[in-house]
C-alpha cells in the first residue's frame, strides 16, 4: 500500500507511515503528505537542509536512505514496483533562496525495473517550474557513483554528486550537493532544475511526491 491507500483508510494527518511493497509483506517507512493538493502523496525524495549525504551507492539508492521526517530518498526498488502496478503522477515541488516556490507535475510517471537501471518514464508536464522538462526526455537510466549509466563519456554522478537520471549530464539533479544561501550560485554540481532557475543555481528545498492518477 501507498500513502493514497493510507489516506483512504482514514489517516489524514501528515507524518511517517509504514507502507508495504506490492504483492509482498516487505515494509518501508515513508513520509505521507496528507494535506497538499488533496493529500495521499507518497514522498519519495526530500532536500531541505543538507543534513544527509546524497552521494550514495547504487544499493543505497535502491533501498533508500536518510530519515523520512527530514532529508531522504525512499528507494528506487519500492518506487519501481509501486509505479508499475498502476498509473502514478509525479509532482516535484521546489523552493529557491529568495522565497519563491514552483512545481512540475507529470501526469504519468514510472520507473523501470533494476534490470533496466530504474529508467525514468514521464509524460504530460504541467506546472510553474518550466515549460520544458528538466528531467531529460526520453527518460534516462539511473546512475550513481558506482553505477555509471549516463550518456556522457564522463561519470556524471561522480562529477556532480548524487544519484540521478543523468543524460550528458542533463538539465537537472535534485540529489546534488547542498549549498547554503549566498554560496548557491554558479554551482554546476548543486541541486539543479535548469528550466526554472538556470544552469548554476542550487535550490534551497525540493520534494518529489507520487500519487495514483485516479486518486
Amino acid at each position: 500500500r501507498d500513502c493514497a491507500e493510507v489516506f483512504k483508510s482514514g489517516h489524514t494527518t501528515n507524518g511517517i507511515y509504514t507502507l508495504t511493497f506490492p504483492n509482498s509483506t516487505e515494509e518501508i517507512k515513508a513520509y505521507c503528505d496528507m494535506e497538499a493538493g488533496g493529500g495521499g502523496w507518497t514522498i519519495i525524495q526530500r532536500r531541505e537542509d543538507g543534513s544527509v549525504d546524497f552521494q550514495r551507492t547504487w544499493k543505497e539508492y535502491k533501498v533508500g536512505f536518510g530519515n523520512p521526517s527530514g532529508e531522504y530518498w525512499l528507494g528506487n526498488e519500492f518506487v519501481s514496483q509501486l509505479t508499475n502496478q498502476q498509473r502514478y503522477v509525479l509532482k516535484i515541488h521546489l523552493k529557491d533562496w529568495e522565497g519563491n516556490e514552483a512545481y512540475s507535475l507529470y501526469e504519468h510517471f514510472y520507473l523501470s525495473s533494476e534490470e533496466l537501471n530504474y529508467r525514468i518514464h514521464l509524460k504530460g508536464l504541467t506546472g510553474t517550474a518550466g515549460k520544458i522538462s528538466s528531467i531529460s526526455q526520453p527518460g534516462n537510466d539511473f546512475s550513481t557513483k558506482d553505477g555509471d549509466n549516463d550518456k556522457c563519456i564522463c561519470k556524471c554522478s561522480q562529477m556532480l554528486t548524487g544519484g540521478w537520471w543523468f543524460d550528458a549530464c542533463g538539465p537537472s539533479n535534485l540529489n546534488g550537493m547542498y549549498y547554503p544561501q549566498r554560496q548557491n550560485t554558479n554551482k554546476f554540481n548543486g541541486i539543479k532544475w535548469y528550466y526554472w532557475k538556470g544552469s548554476g543555481y542550487s535550490l534551497k528545498a525540493t520534494t518529489m511526491m507520487i500519487r495514483p492518477a485516479d486518486f
Partner: antibody
Framework: EVQLLESGGGLVQPGGSLRLSCAAS????????MSWVRQAPGKGLEWVSV????????YYADSVKGRFTISRDNSKNTLYLQLNSLRAEDTAVYYC???????????????WGQGTLVTVSS | DIQMTQSPSSVSASVGDRVTITCRAS??????LAWYQQKPGKAPKLLIY???SLQSGVPSRFSGSGSGTDFTLTISTLQPEDFATYYC?????????FGGGTKVEIK
C-alpha cells in the same frame, strides 16, 4: 566518429568582421555545450566563449565581450562565432570545441576542430 | 579571474622517465581542473578532467592528482609520443583559464 570542421577564417583589417562556422557530426549536437578556444601564434590557449545546449545561455571572456557573439543552430548541427570590431590581438587559430557535458559552467573540451586561422592586419 | 600557473615551463626528459608537471590556481578550484596535451600544428587533446579522471582512450601512464589550489600531472613512463606541450585548465568558474603550458622535450 566525432568531427568538428571550422570555416570562415581569413585575413581581415582592424575593425572588420568575420563569421566562423563549425559543422559538427558524429554525436548528438543538441545534447552538449559548445565552446570556442583560440591560440595566438606561438602562444598558449585562451578560452573565448561557451554556449548552452539550447543557446539560451552564453558566456564570454572579458577580452571579447561586446565584440564577439556565439550562437548555434541545432537543426543544422552548426556552431557559430561572429567576430566584430576585430583587433590585431585577436589574431589566432580559433578552435571549435565540444564540451564533455552539457554544463556551461564547467567546460572540459573532449573534442576539438582542426582550427581556423584569423589574421587581423592592415 | 583565476590565474593558473604551470611549472616548469619546459622539461627535458628521456623515454622511460617519470615526468611530473604542476599547476597552481590563484584560488581554490576544488577538483575542477583538466589537463590537455598539444603537439605542434595540432589541436589539444583532453587527458584528465575533474583533476584525476582519465579521459576515455588515454593511456594509464597519465594520471592527475590534487585539489584546492595545487595539482599534478604525472607521466609514469615517458613514451616517444608523449613529447608535447601540456596545459592545465580550471573549470571552476568563468572565465575558464589555462596555464601557460609546459613543454616536454627530448633530452
Amino acid at each position: 566518429e566525432v568531427q568538428l570542421l571550422e570555416s570562415g577564417g581569413g585575413l581581415v583589417q582592424p575593425g572588420g568582421s568575420l563569421r566562423l562556422s563549425c559543422a559538427a557530426s558524429g554525436f548528438t549536437f543538441r545534447k552538449y555545450a559548445m565552446s570556442w578556444v583560440r591560440q595566438a601564434p606561438g602562444k598558449g590557449l585562451e578560452w573565448v566563449s561557451v554556449i548552452s545546449v539550447s543557446g539560451g545561455n552564453t558566456y564570454y571572456a572579458d577580452s571579447v565581450k561586446g565584440r564577439f557573439t556565439i550562437s548555434r543552430d541545432n537543426s543544422k548541427n552548426t556552431l557559430y562565432l561572429q567576430l566584430n570590431s576585430l583587433r590585431a590581438e585577436d589574431t589566432a587559430v580559433y578552435y571549435c570545441a565540444k564540451d564533455l557535458t552539457d554544463i556551461v559552467l564547467m567546460v572540459y573540451v573532449d573534442y576539438w576542430g582542426q582550427g581556423t586561422l584569423v589574421t587581423v592586419s592592415s | 579571474d583565476i590565474q593558473m600557473t604551470q611549472s616548469p615551463s619546459s622539461v627535458s626528459a628521456s623515454v622511460g622517465d617519470r615526468v611530473t608537471i604542476t599547476c597552481r590556481a590563484s584560488q581554490d578550484i576544488d577538483r575542477w581542473l583538466a589537463w590537455y596535451q598539444q603537439k605542434p600544428g595540432k589541436a589539444p587533446k583532453l587527458l584528465i578532467y575533474a583533476a584525476s579522471s582519465l579521459q576515455s582512450g588515454v593511456p594509464s601512464r597519465f594520471s592527475g592528482s590534487g585539489s584546492g589550489t595545487d595539482f599534478t600531472l604525472t607521466i609514469s613512463t615517458l613514451q616517444p609520443e608523449d613529447f608535447a606541450t601540456y596545459y592545465c585548465q580550471q573549470a571552476n568558474s568563468l572565465p575558464f583559464t589555462f596555464g601557460g603550458g609546459t613543454k616536454v622535450e627530448i633530452k
